[in-house]
């Protein structure tokens, strides 16, 4: 799977995490910080 950083167009997309662009899947993906979950790392669960 080809991975790169998300474009500046997606700034602010991942609230508490790192935005990764999964090129082959045509998807942006949020890698959440510890304690956060949700598609956009918007939920704190600890």
């Amino acid at each position: 799977v080809s991975i790169t950083k998300c474009s500046s167009d997606m700034n602010g997309y991942c609230l508490h995490g790192q935005c990764i662009y999964l090129v082959d899947m045509s998807q942006n993906y949020c890698r959440c910080e510890v304690g956060y979950t949700g598609v956009r790392c918007e939920h704190f669960f600890l």
Epitope: S7, D9, Y13, R40
Partner: antibody, heavy 116, light 106 residues
Framework: EDQLQQSGAELVKPGASVKLSCTAS????????IQWVKLRPEQGLEWIGR????????KYVPKFQGKATITADTSSNTAYLQLSSLTSEDTAVYYC?????????WGQGTTLTVSS | DIQMTQSPSSLSASLGGKVTITCKAS??????IAWYQHKPGKGPRLLIQ???TLQPGIPSRFSGSGSGRDYSFSISNLEPEDIATYYC????????FGGGTKLEIK
């Protein structure tokens, strides 16, 4: 199956306003950005702006600032494009487009005709 | 705002031939460019994203390349169904479409 269902065709008089809707099914709009795009056959595709439904933040192309207002209602999973002070230049097909979890998933488009 | 200059605005080519369309960005867009096909009465169809990544179901006759400010899109072995208008889209910083290229068959 993910879908973006746009409202039906509109015939509106010059000077009036119109509000177009884009209702998502199969996914939560809060997980995405919703973009709006204008298509006129001779002028081509133009990006109008976008909204982040999670917080309501919007971005517009300067050309459409004051002409277009993008809003979202997360309770109904719907995004809106309001166009004001309509002229013949606003006659076009308007598309809502989802980006974020999936690259650029388009609605079917709404035809807006401005005519007296 | 990033501007996208697409050329040519129209072109005519023979069946079985090859055409190339270019888009030049007003600044480096870091390969964040997509290419769309549009036919009258239909919605735009995504062909390629991230410069060269073909979407599922898109024939390998379509290809893209480039970096920095300069990008190109090619169709080889032209077929009648390729008659359409093609647009580039930068999505590095917000979004901007190119002006479009209308493709006709000789």
């Amino acid at each position: 199956e993910d879908q973006l269902q746009q409202s039906g065709a509109e015939l509106v008089k010059p000077g009036a306003s119109v509000k177009l809707s884009c209702t998502a099914s199969g996914f939560n709009i809060k997980d995405t950005y919703i973009q709006w795009v204008k298509l006129r056959p001779e002028q081509g595709l133009e990006w109008i702006g976008r909204i982040d439904p999670l917080n309501g933040n919007t971005k517009y192309v300067p050309k459409f600032q004051g002409k277009a207002t993008i809003t979202a209602d997360t309770s109904s999973n719907t995004a809106y494009l309001q166009l004001s002070s309509l002229t013949s230049e606003d006659t076009a097909v308007y598309y809502c487009v989802r980006s974020g979890t999936l690259f650029d998933f388009w609605g079917q488009g709404t035809t807006l005709t401005v005519s007296s | 705002d990033i501007q996208m200059t697409q050329s040519p605005s129209s072109l005519s080519a023979s069946l079985g031939g090859k055409v190339t369309i270019t888009c030049k960005a007003s600044q480096d867009i870091h390969k964040y460019i997509a290419w769309y096909q549009h036919k009258p009465g239909k919605g735009p169809r995504l062909l390629i994203q991230y410069t060269s990544t073909l979407q599922p179901g898109i024939p390998s006759r379509f290809s893209g390349s480039g970096s920095g400010r300069d990008y190109s899109f090619s169709i080889s072995n032209l077929e009648p169904e390729d008659i359409a208008t093609y647009y580039c889209l930068q999505y590095d910083n917000l979004r901007t479409f190119g002006g479009g290229t209308k493709l006709e068959i000789k």
